[in-house]
Interface confidence: medium
Amino acid sequence: RAQLERSLRDVVEKTIQKYGTNPEETAAEESWDYVQFQLRCCGWHYPQDWFQVLILRGNGSEAHRVPCSCYNLSATNDSTILDKVILPQLSRLGHLARSRHSADICAVPAESHIYREGCAQGLQKWLHNN
């Protein structure tokens, strides 16, 4: 089981680091988006894991960004963000649709309405229970 956990982490780390860099290879990304969406978590340790990804990193005053699967709908009151940005993408995740759009990446708002827990613990629990 420990070996399985290590292998899983290796896959996840590679997925995070290569996220969005190849539009032709999105299977691992879609799977990880679905994990974040279902387990209500973001990143491996914490959401900041995503800030190492070049295409997601803001510079200076520009906001950092994360995959929209990190968004916690129950913590977001801004209807504009919900209606125009997040809900369309999460509905794709919910239906496990196989289409990717650049808008799958969302800016982190000031109050960071994203899941604040990493997915590691949830995945490890899941592995132990199965």
Epitope: H45, Y46, Q52, V108, E111, S112, R116
Partner: antibody
Amino acid sequence: VQLQQSGPELEKPGASVKISCKASGYSFTGYNMNWVKQNNGKSERLEWIGNIDPYYGGTTYNRKFKGKATLTVDKSSSTAYMQLKSLTSEDSAVYYCARSVGPMDYWGQGTSVTVSS
Amino acid sequence: DIQMTQSPASLSASVGETVTITCRTSENVYSYLAWYQQKQGKSPQLLVSFAKTLAEGVPSRFSGSGSGTQFSLKISSLQPEDSGSYFCQHHSDNPWTFGGGTELEIK
């Protein structure tokens, strides 16, 4: 971004001390606040004590400091606190607060704590 | 806990030279490694995050590399203001730990 820490403390063995870290220039609840210990003198090694998520108040401690340090926040004043209890000479050090976005990107100026009878 | 072995403990170099500081971790920390600079009596300052990303405002003569268990910080074209202590730190698993530090003296 600024992290302003409280002033130096001189305490007796067995006492407790609470040091503060006031954040400004960013969204306080959007980042974890960490605390780091740095010994004075020859070995200036840095030790991570733990961190707190100001949004929920959740804490993560280095097990070495569990029971020694207690981390809290006051969201209304954007201030983080660390209380150290049952002080001994081993606790004499400079303590830093540091914001983290993964690594610790902004640090306070440090608070010197001296424990002496 | 993950052990951080940083070397050398101290080094002395002249203005314009290039120096490299290395950091070895006892376990795989992926890219979760940061480098800090600390000047006498001051707080540490972030230089490099996620092993190779230069922090805002850090001169391009600093560069980080490595992943897994082997990392290095290279400072090329040394300047007098580069003197001070340098620390590596992982933020991979609890507890985060730091290297023992490298004291850099500019001759």
